[in-house]
């Protein structure tokens, strides 16, 4: 009986027309929903004139529905046996969901003050843009809403840059009607041990962000993995958001209406510096902000992101040294509520059940010739917000699973 | 739009001092670093100095430090250049320039002659 | 200190003529050089920026380019008001400094 379940299995884990797992690969079945926290600076001018710690107060729920798209441009290459395609970008906001509304305000980092001081650091140009800061009436923060902030905004002080810079700026900006990839990944047909196992992204096996090991594309993306998952295995699995490979280990057994999943969770080791960690050396991009890289969960992301000084973390600064969450006062880390996990059905190797949880933060630095970035007498990586983007398996489709899958090896 | 009022001359005796101005006025004063620069007559543009108006914090060129010293008077949105222990060598023009797009606004220019 | 070289100080030129003032750095300054035009009596006037940007209102027959250590001013359909003194100047590093200018007259 065992072997007629494996090969069905087989059969109908291959991401090609007319098996169970296309058909919820190419459109996810389950709602997935992402919902967002802001950090709402409250002392923003005792920061800018005292270098003072960053006082946050968290703002959220604000909830949005994603990736409710099909896959677009999916198309088979049988020489290979891999399948490529485009994963579009959509958000809906959810008001039931959510504490207020899209024009709620918040008082946050100046995104646009925070890059341009960092990516244009000759004294002479730092000096042009603060006469610009101040010609637009921007400072070290600003207010925006909360559309502004994630989907963009048109910035007054880069619009008066007279160099040729996109203008608007937004945390997430540019998301609807933007697709991630191209993915390849391997359909399986060949050797089910591959499935979904990401070939190629944008055309290359690796990223051109990070030194050797760090740069190469693992895994898959998390969404499924090849059937027949074991306890001890470590789990690679890519993200664009984050700009790299990543890992999930075992942690527990969990019930999930009626089927038994293994929950993978992101380990505290992933985010340890090179000192804990050896194999982390190469996601140490910097001396500087990284004390020589000792500090730890927190991951420079700016080559990914033009040059701005994007830094990820998980929310709160869960699993961070304490140099980093030291300057700003509000934060309270814990493993429940913050940290990553992936519920995954180890027969098929679908993830019936995630909660992805990441923190986008941006470093500012003082600037002799910028007026508002003047009295700084420290660098901060400024938390402006925290996702949890999650999706669990609908009660119709646990049932069809516990009948078609579970059910027939139990 | 931006203007600088520089006194257009300057007579100055050997080893005596002298305080250079310049008004500004069509912009904010203390929002833009203010530079100065020397031309002497026949010859290239040296740079001095530049000063922030909104704290007086300055930076100079080696050369010209302990021979000039930038200061502002915020309440009359004016900069000022002293010049101390004068010598022929200081004789020339000397502008100044607040950074806006770049060094893209000049005073006219204060000609300083040192002489007996 | 970072010295720029105009090696010519002296071009003779003709209305309608394109002509090409040269400036050398003594090393690697990126983009960070301006250009500026200067006649008798007056105060420079910036033409150039990061290299290769016009100022507004500078006519596009100002054309800066270059990289580095070599830089070029070219103006294409030289007019008369063009007869003047000019300057290059680097921001890559302090302190600031300036070419010792070119001066366009006419044949």
């Known amino acids: 009986g065992d072997l007629l379940i494996q090969k069905t299995i087989k059969k109908q884990v291959v991401l090609e027309e007319g098996t169970i797992a296309f058909k919820n690969w190419v459109k996810t079945g389950t709602e997935v929903y992402r919902q967002f926290w802001i950090f709402d600076v409250q002392n923003p001018q005792e920061v800018m004139m005292n270098s003072s710690n960053i006082q946050v107060k968290q703002r959220g729920p604000y909830t949005y529905r994603v990736r409710f798209l099909a896959k677009e441009n999916v198309t088979q290459d049988a020489e290979d046996n891999t399948v490529s395609f485009l994963q579009p970008n959509g958000a809906i906001f959810e008001p039931s969901l959510s504490v207020g509304t899209e024009a709620d305000n918040f008082t946050v980092l100046n995104l646009a003050v925070a890059a341009a001081s960092h990516i244009y650091q000759n004294q002479f140009v730092q000096m042009i843009l603060n006469s610009l800061i101040n010609k637009s009436k921007s400072s070290m923060f600003q207010v925006r809403t909360l559309r502004e902030l994630l989907w963009g905004y048109r910035d007054p002080f880069l619009s008066l840059v007279p160099y040729p810079v996109t203008t608007t700026v937004g945390l997430f900006y540019p998301y609807n009607n933007t697709a991630d990839g191209v993915y390849k990944v391997f359909n399986g047909k060949d050797n089910i041990s591959k499935v979904a196992i990401i070939d190629t992204y944008k055309g290359k096996r690796n990223l051109s962000y990070w030194e050797s090991h760090c740069d190469m594309i693992n895994g898959t993306d998390a969404a499924s993995f090849p059937p027949f998952v074991e306890k001890s295995q470590v789990l690679q699995f890519f993200s664009s958001d984050i700009c790299r490979s990543i890992y999930a280990v075992f942690e527990s057994d969990v019930n999930l209406k009626g089927i038994p999943v293994y929950r993978f969770v992101l380990p505290s080791k992933a985010f340890a510096s090179p000192v804990e960690n050896p194999d982390n050396y190469c996601f140490c991009t910097e001396k500087i902000i990284s004390k020589n890289c000792t500090s730890y969960g927190v991951l420079d992301i700016s080559k990914c992101k033009e040059g701005r000084p994007v830094y990820i973390s998980l929310p709160h600064f869960l699993y961070a040294s304490p140099d980093v969450s030291e300057p700003i006062d509000g934060l309270n880390p814990n493993e429940e509520e913050h940290r990553t996990y992936l519920d995954i059905e180890p027969i098929t190797g679908f993830t019936l059940q995630f909660a992805k949880r990441l923190q986008v933060n941006l470093l500012v630095k003082p600037s002799e010739k910028i007026q508002v970035l003047k009295n700084l007498k420290r660098n901060y990586i400024v938390p402006i917000l925290w996702l949890n983007e999650t999706g669990t398996i609908g009660d119709e489709k646990a049932n069809m699973f516990r009948s078609q899958v579970t059910g027939k090896i139990n | 739009q931006v203007q600088l009022q520089q006194p257009g001359a300057e007579l100055v005796k050997p080893g005596a001092s002298v305080k250079l101005s310049c008004k500004a006025s069509g912009y904010t004063f203390t929002s833009y670093w203010m530079h100065w620069v020397k031309q002497r007559p026949g010859q290239g543009l040296e740079w001095i100095g530049e000063?922030?108006?909104?704290?007086?914090?300055?930076n100079y060129n080696q050369k010209f430090k302990g021979k000039a010293t930038l200061t502002v008077d915020k309440s009359s949105s004016t900069a000022y250049m002293q010049l101390s222990s004068l010598t022929s060598e200081d004789s020339a023009v000397y502008y100044c320039?607040?950074?806006?797009?770049?060094?893209?606004?000049w005073g006219q220019g204060t000609t300083l002659t040192v002489s007996s | 200190d970072i010295v720029l070289t105009q090696s010519q100080k002296f071009m003779s030129t003709s209305v309608g003529d394109r002509v090409s003032v040269t400036c050398k750095a003594s090393q690697n300054v990126g983009t960070n050089v301006a250009w500026y035009q200067q006649k008798p009596g007056q105060s420079p006037k910036a033409l150039i920026y990061?290299?290769?940007y016009r100022y507004s209102g500078v006519p596009d027959r100002f054309t800066g380019s270059g990289s580095g250590t070599d830089f070029t001013l070219t103006i294409s359909n030289v007019q008369s008001e063009d007869l003047a003194e000019y300057f290059c100047?680097?921001?890559?590093?302090?302190?600031?400094?300036f070419g010792a200018g070119t001066k366009l007259e006419l044949k």
């Open positions: 320039a607040p950074i806006h797009y770049g060094l893209d606004n």
């Open positions: 990061s290299a290769s």
């Open positions: 000063i922030d108006p909104s704290d007086s914090h300055a």
């Open positions: 100047q680097q921001y890559n590093s302090y302190p600031l400094t």
